[in-house]
C-alpha cells in the first residue's frame, strides 16, 4: 500500500502518509533575560520557557541553550512576537534641535544555524525605527513565514536589544515552528 | 491497519490518519461593532462576520456570540489583525508642554475561555504605545501562533478600545484558527 | 479502502487523504523594483525572487509575472511582510505649524485575481499612518491569514508606494503561501 | 560570570569635573542597558541615568544639564561624566546592568568627595 | 517624578521570624516594583522584580506581592544572613526611583 494511493494520481508525493498529531511542534514563551556575551557581528539571542503555561515541545521538536532542534527535515512555519519596551531615548531631542541623526531601532531575527555551515542564516527580520514623543513607549513585532528546514538545523530568536525585551507576559513575547 | 504503518517507524503516532480538507478551520472578518457591557476586568470583545464574503467556518468549526467554539482537541494556528484608527489624543499635547504621562495605548488580545476554568487564559496580547504627532492616525496589529486547545474551548478577541477598531474593510479586521 | 476510514466516524471526509510533503507551498523573497505601469484605481504589485536564497516553489504552485498562482483548490495560509523606509515627509512640518493634514501612508494588501471576475479581491491590507519625528524611518507591516481559493486563482502583493520598499534583504520583505 | 567594576577618581574640587568608567565582563555592552545610581547619606539611592545597548541615554531631568553617559563597546566601558560638583554630590556611585525596568547586576561602587 | 516610600527606616527581628517591609508609591506602577538588599559593605543585589518574581539565585525564603500603588516584601524565615538594608525601586516610569530604605537588625 503506497502514499500516492491517496493522492491525485498527477501529484508526485514526496512524503509517507503520516498522522498530524506526530508532526515536530513547538511554542516557547519569554523568560526574564540576562546578560550574556554573543558572537561580535550577532545580535544576542533570547532564552525560553518550553515546559510551563503555553509553552510546549513536541514529537522530537527540543528546545536546549537558546535553540530549537529541528529533528526532521521538510517545510516548517516559523514565528516569533517580540515585544519591547523603552524610554525615550535623546533621539527626540536631538531631532527637535533639527540635527538629523541614525533613528534608535529595535529589531528581531529568526537565524538559522547549520552546523555544516560557517555563517547562520537570517531567516525572518522585523527591524523598526523608534522615535517617540512620550515617556514610555512599547510596541511588539511580529514574524512568521515558511521554511524549508534540515534535520539537525537550529533556530533562534536574535534581538538588538536584550533589555528592552517585555519579560512580563507569556502572551507578549513568543516562539514557535511547526511542521506543515 | 493502523495509523502509524504510513509513519517513520521511530516514530509515536498520537492521532489516526484525517483528511486535510475535513479539518475545523475559521476566518471571520469584521463588521461594525455596537456597544456592550462586558466583564470588568477584562476588555471588550469583538463580534464578527462569519459567512459573508471572505468568511467562513467549516467542519464543525463554529462560531456563536463573539465565541469561536473549538470542536476537537489538538493544536491550532490561531491569528488575528486588528487595524486601529483615531485621531489625537490629550497624549501628545500634554507632552509638547513638557508634562511626562502614561501613553495612550491600543492592545488586542486573544483569549481562550474554558467553561470548567473560572479565569480566561490570554494566548496572545499585542499592545502598543500610541502617541502620534498628527491629527489622524491608523495602525494593524497583528498576532498569531499555535495553540494545544481541547474540545469546547472557546476563542474570542479583546481589545482595548472598542471605538478605535476600523470596522470599514474585510481585509483590515479579521480573526481565524485552524487545525494543524 | 477509503479516506475516512482514518477519520473519526462522526466526522465527513471532504478530500482524500494526501501526503503533505506534496502539497503547492512557495516563500518568495524581495528584489530591487523597478517602475511598471500599473491599472489606475490599482497600488502597483510587487515582483519576487522565487529560485535563489530563501525563496521557492514546489508541488505546481508557480510564480509567474508579479503572481503566485494557486494549481489546486482549497484552503491556503497566505502571508506576507513588507519593510517599509523613508524619510520624513512633509507631514511632520505641515503638523509642527499646526495645520491638520491627511497623514502620510504605507499600505500592503494582498490581492487575489480570478480571471473570470471583472474586479480582484483584497484577501489582507495592512495600513500605517507614518509621522515620523526623526530623519529617516523604517517598519515593516505583516499579514497573514487563511483563504478558501479555487485553482487558477493569483495571488499578488500590491502597494502604495513602491519606492520605499526595502529590497536590502530576503528576511526582511517576503510573500508566500501553503495549502493546509 | 556577569561582573561590573567602577574607577573614579576618589577626590574632585568643586565646581571641577567627574570622570567615572564602568568596565564590564560577561554581557556584550552592544546589546543590554547600563545604568548609573548614586548613594550619599542625605539622598539615599538616586539614579542618575541611563545607556541602552542600541546607544540611546537618558537622565534624571534634575541632573540633566550636568551629566554625560557615553560608552565603548569594543573596550567594555561605559562612562560618566558629570559638570560643575558640589559638596552634595559626594556620594558612592554605582554602575548596574539590567532590563527595561531594574539593575540586575550592580557594581561594587566607588567613592567619591568633593572637597577643596 | 513618582514618589517611592518605605515608612519603616529600621526593623528589628528575631532569626526564624517572618518579616514583612512595605513600600508605597505615589501613583499606580503597574507592578514594575523592584527590591534590591544592600549589605553593610555596600553590595547591592536585585531580589525581587516585577513585584513578585524571583531573580536567579535568590533564595525562596524571598517573596513579593502587591499592586497599583502598594507592595511588600516579605521573608518567611530569618537568617542571618538576610542582616542588611532593603530598597523598593519603580521602573515604570523615567526617572526610576528608589525608596529612603528599610534596615533590618537582629534582635
Known amino acids: 500500500l503506497k502514499g500516492q494511493e491517496f493522492a491525485p494520481s498527477h501529484q508526485q508525493v514526496y512524503a509517507p502518509l503520516r498522522a498530524d498529531g506526530d508532526k515536530p511542534r513547538a511554542h516557547l514563551t519569554v523568560v526574564r533575560q540576562t546578560p550574556t556575551q554573543h558572537l561580535k557581528n550577532q545580535f544576542p539571542a533570547l532564552h525560553w520557557e518550553h515546559e510551563l503555561g503555553l509553552a510546549f515541545t513536541k514529537n522530537r521538536m527540543n528546545y536546549t541553550n537558546k535553540f530549537l532542534l529541528i529533528p526532521e527535515s521538510g517545510d516548517y512555519f516559523v514565528y516569533s512576537q517580540v515585544t519591547f519596551r523603552g524610554m525615550t531615548s535623546e533621539c527626540s531631542e536631538i531631532r527637535q534641535a533639527g540635527r538629523p541623526n541614525k533613528p534608535d531601532s529595535i529589531t528581531v531575527v529568526i537565524t538559522k544555524v547549520t552546523d555544516s555551515y560557517p555563517e547562520p542564516t537570517q531567516l525572518l527580520m522585523g527591524t523598526k525605527s523608534v522615535c517617540e514623543v512620550g515617556s514610555n513607549w512599547f510596541q511588539p513585532i511580529y514574524l512568521g513565514a515558511m521554511f524549508s528546514l534540515q534535520e539537525g538545523d537550529k533556530l533562534m530568536v536574535n534581538v538588538s536589544d536584550i533589555s528592552l525585551v517585555d519579560y512580563t507576559k507569556e502572551d507578549k513575547t513568543f516562539f514557535g515552528a511547526f511542521l506543515l | 491497519l493502523k495509523g502509524q504503518e504510513f509513519a517513520p517507524s521511530h516514530q509515536q503516532v498520537y492521532a489516526p490518519l484525517r483528511a486535510d480538507g475535513d479539518k475545523p478551520r475559521a476566518h471571520l472578518t469584521v463588521v461594525r461593532q455596537t456597544p456592550t457591557q462586558h466583564l470588568k476586568n477584562q476588555f471588550p470583545a469583538l463580534h464578527w462576520e462569519h459567512e459573508l464574503g471572505l468568511a467562513f467556518t467549516k467542519n464543525r468549526m463554529n462560531y456563536t456570540n463573539k465565541f469561536l467554539l473549538i470542536p476537537e482537541s489538538g493544536d491550532y494556528f490561531v491569528y488575528s489583525q486588528v487595524t486601529f484608527r483615531g485621531m489625537t489624543s490629550e497624549c501628545s499635547e500634554i507632552r509638547q508642554a513638557g508634562r511626562p504621562n502614561k501613553p495612550d495605548s491600543i492592545t488586542v488580545v486573544i483569549t481562550k475561555v474554558t467553561d470548567s476554568y473560572p479565569e480566561p487564559t490570554q494566548l496572545l496580547m499585542g499592545t502598543k504605545s500610541v502617541c502620534e504627532v498628527g491629527s489622524n492616525w491608523f495602525q494593524p496589529i497583528y498576532l498569531g501562533a499555535m495553540f494545544s486547545l481541547q474540545e469546547g474551548d472557546k476563542l474570542m478577541v479583546n481589545v482595548s478600545d472598542i471605538s478605535l477598531v476600523d470596522y470599514t474593510k474585510e481585509d483590515k479586521t479579521f480573526f481565524g484558527a485552524f487545525l494543524l | 479502502l477509503k479516506g475516512q476510514e482514518f477519520a473519526p466516524s462522526h466526522q465527513q471526509v471532504y478530500a482524500p487523504l494526501r501526503a503533505d510533503g506534496d502539497k503547492p507551498r512557495a516563500h518568495l523573497t524581495v528584489v530591487r523594483q523597478t517602475p511598471t505601469q500599473h491599472l489606475k484605481n490599482q497600488f502597483p504589485a510587487l515582483h519576487w525572487e522565487h529560485e535563489l536564497g530563501l525563496a521557492f516553489t514546489k508541488n505546481r504552485m508557480n510564480y509567474t509575472n508579479k503572481f503566485l498562482l494557486i494549481p489546486e483548490s482549497g484552503d491556503y495560509f497566505v502571508y506576507s511582510q513588507v519593510t517599509f523606509r523613508g524619510m520624513t515627509s512633509e507631514c511632520s512640518e505641515i503638523r509642527q505649524a499646526g495645520r491638520p493634514n491627511k497623514p502620510d501612508s504605507i499600505t500592503v494588501v494582498i490581492t487575489k485575481v480570478t480571471d473570470s471576475y471583472p474586479e480582484p479581491t483584497q484577501l489582507l491590507m495592512g495600513t500605517k499612518s507614518v509621522c515620523e519625528v526623526g530623519s529617516n524611518w523604517f517598519q515593516p507591516i505583516y499579514l497573514g491569514a487563511m483563504f478558501s481559493l479555487q485553482e487558477g486563482d493569483k495571488l499578488m502583493v500590491n502597494v502604495s508606494d513602491i519606492s520605499l520598499v526595502d529590497y536590502t534583504k530576503e528576511d526582511k520583505t517576503f510573500f508566500g503561501a501553503f495549502l493546509l | 560570570q556577569i561582573q561590573l567594576k567602577e574607577s573614579g577618581p576618589g577626590l574632585v574640587a568643586p565646581s571641577q569635573s567627574l570622570s567615572i568608567t564602568c568596565t564590564v565582563s560577561?554581557?556584550?555592552?552592544?546589546?543590554?542597558?547600563v545604568d548609573w545610581v548614586r548613594q550619599s547619606p542625605g539622598k539615599g539611592l538616586e539614579w542618575l541615568g541611563v545607556?541602552?545597548?542600541?546607544?540611546?541615554?537618558n537622565y534624571n531631568s534634575a541632573l540633566k544639564s550636568r551629566l554625560s553617559i557615553s560608552k565603548d563597546n569594543s573596550k567594555s566601558q561605559v562612562f560618566l561624566k558629570m559638570n560643575s560638583l558640589q559638596s552634595d554630590d559626594s556620594a558612592i556611585y554605582y554602575c548596574?546592568?539590567?532590563?527595561?525596568?531594574?539593575?540586575?547586576?550592580w557594581g561594587q561602587g566607588t567613592s567619591v568627595t568633593v572637597s577643596s | 517624578d513618582i514618589q517611592m516610600t518605605q515608612t519603616t527606616s529600621s526593623l528589628s527581628a528575631s532569626l526564624g521570624d517572618r518579616v514583612t517591609i512595605s513600600c508605597r508609591a505615589s501613583?499606580?506602577?503597574?507592578?514594575?516594583l523592584n527590591w534590591y538588599q544592600q549589605k553593610p559593605d555596600g553590595t547591592v543585589k536585585l531580589l525581587i522584580y516585577?513585584?513578585?518574581r524571583l531573580h536567579s539565585g535568590v533564595p525562596s525564603r524571598f517573596s513579593g506581592s502587591g499592586s497599583g500603588t502598594d507592595y511588600s516584601l516579605t521573608i518567611s524565615n530569618l537568617e542571618q544572613e538576610d542582616i542588611a538594608t532593603y530598597f523598593c525601586?519603580?521602573?515604570?516610569?523615567?526617572?526610576?526611583?528608589f525608596g529612603s530604605g528599610t534596615k533590618l537588625e537582629i534582635k
Open positions: 548596574a546592568s539590567g532590563n527595561f525596568d531594574a539593575m540586575d547586576y
Open positions: 560577561g554581557f556584550s555592552l552592544s546589546s543590554y542597558g
Open positions: 545607556i541602552w545597548g542600541f546607544g540611546g541615554t
Open positions: 501613583q499606580d506602577i503597574s507592578n514594575y
Open positions: 516585577y513585584t513578585s
Open positions: 525601586q519603580q521602573g515604570n516610569t523615567l526617572p526610576f526611583t
